[in-house]
Amino acid sequence: EPHSLRYNLTVLSWDGSVQSGFLTEVHLDGQPFLRCDRQKCRAKPQGQWAEDVLGNKTWDRETRDLTGNGKDLRMTLAHIKDQKEGLHSLQEIRVCEIHEDNSTRSSQHFYYDGELFLSQNLETKEWTMPQSSRAQTLAMNVRNFLKEDAMKTKTHYHAMHADCLQELRRYLKSGVVLRRTVPPMVNVTRSEASEGNITVTCRASGFYPWNITLSWRQDGVSLSHDTQQWGDVLPDGNGTYQTWVATRICQGEEQRFTCYMEHSGNHSTHPVPSGKVLVLQSHWQ
């Protein structure tokens, strides 16, 4: 998996007036990393990982750089002619990646009221936009503004690709990004589904990185995808992830079913607990 740095800047306008604040969220290798407003940047992730890895680092440089970016984005929002009454948002998302073979990817995306209207490949400088007329109008608006401000185009947007990669490399070098592995905690629960059937749910939590295989097996053979229901792999707020998988089985056959978990080259199997049904609910509708 490549190392990645992702910036998500948001500015707001109210009744056509651009607000003075801004919000930036920075993700490092898919993990919440920094959260910045116009006052300062703070380390975002909670828990032991943040303390161990980030230490007491101050983020003055990031605050300065991202405050400049916030100002640029506010100016861009002010030039959007489509300002109607009420609250509107302009988001700029910037992503850069360094792959194992040292190749790089960088892109920039603009969203207005949550809708993507303009993207740029920061390596090829190629712009793309969705087909909808609203997106096209917004895109023309913003691109014209960026062209008018040639100085900003050269100094800021043109340099973003290099800046993002430079920051990512700096974080990698400083040891902020550790290719750490945290194994999951796995637990299996059972719940009454219908007459003669039970739903068994296998939950994995507290694992990193996010790639995981979690599936049900009968007598050692995987159940087909359409007989299982999967939850999304979600951050659990501690710099780690959680997910689940459920299936419906016949009561009395629990001992033949196991939850199979594979994570970072390690694997384990987890039986269905025997005994009384404890949880009276079902993931299945």
Epitope: Q218, D219, G220, V221, S222, S224, T227, R256, G265, P271
Partner: antibody, heavy 122, light 106 residues
Framework: QVQLQESGGGLVQPGGSMRLSCGAS????????MNWVRQAPGKGLEWLSY????????YYADSVKGRFTISRDNAKNSLNLQMHSLRDEDTAVYYC???????????????WGQGTTVTVSS | EIVLTQSPSSLSASVGDRVTITCRAS??????LNWYQQKPGKAPKLLIY???SLQSGVPSRFSGSGSGTDFTLTISSLQPEDFATYYC????????FGGGTKLEIK
């Protein structure tokens, strides 16, 4: 006595169809996942298809996908393999096999039938 | 599809010999590996499941080991009835058999 008995084999022309059956006795058939495995003359074992106890999970080998259909009738203690578009290379002894339900099993086949011979030839 | 490669494909040995047959998977299958014995004109017979667990009724001279991609079936002291063909089979990803190892009398 736990037993599996295949039937339905014989001679068929290329492009033809054939239906194999496997009768189960001596155990609760509906509890067990089942398979078809074949063995061409002088060759090794080739797994063909798997069906879970309640028919909710079905798998096929690439070599027969789209041509063969596995099914079961738990009320009749019977496993079936419907074969279409048969080719010369489908000539083999066809076995049905039961998946063991022993705790900690890894998809092993503990009971096998004696096999039925299918010959595809013009 | 996971490919199982058995070696050797054939092997000559004498009664009382210790014999080892190997099975290599094209990717890690953890311990999802089983071993079978087949005699001419007969159906296969399960010997070992889960890489190392002995099936009920199988003599203790048969043992299995390995995990991941490399597995072995060992017969500690060959008996006359052990001359047969041996197959490995995996269930990690659907199901496949190895090509077989024919064990003959020297």
């Amino acid at each position: 006595q736990v037993q599996l008995q295949e039937s339905g084999g014989g001679l068929v022309q290329p492009g033809g169809s054939m239906r194999l059956s496997c009768g189960a006795s001596g155990f609760t058939f509906s509890r067990y996942s089942m398979n078809w495995v074949r063995q061409a003359p002088g060759k090794g074992l080739e797994w063909l298809s798997y069906i879970s106890s309640r028919s909710s999970t079905i798998y096929y080998a690439d070599s027969v996908k789209g041509r063969f259909t596995i099914s079961r009738d738990n009320a009749k203690n019977s496993l079936n393999l419907q074969m279409h578009s048969l080719r010369d290379e489908d000539t083999a002894v066809y076995y049905c096999a039961r998946v063991s339900d022993i705790t900690g099993n890894t998809g092993s086949f503990d009971i096998w039938g004696q096999g039925t011979t299918v010959t595809v030839s013009s | 599809e996971i490919v199982l490669t058995q070696s050797p494909s054939s092997l000559s040995a004498s009664v009382g010999d210790r014999v080892t047959i190997t099975c290599r998977a094209s990717q890690s299958i953890h311990n999802y590996l089983n071993w079978y014995q087949q005699k001419p004109g007969k159906a296969p017979k399960l010997l070992i499941y889960a890489a190392s667990s002995l099936q009920s009724g199988v003599p203790s001279r048969f043992s299995g080991s390995g995990s991941g991609t490399d597995f072995t079936l060992t017969i500690s002291s060959l008996q006359p009835e052990d001359f047969a063909t041996y197959y490995c089979q995996q269930s990690y990803s659907t199901l496949t058999f190895g090509g077989g190892t024919k064990l003959e009398i020297k």
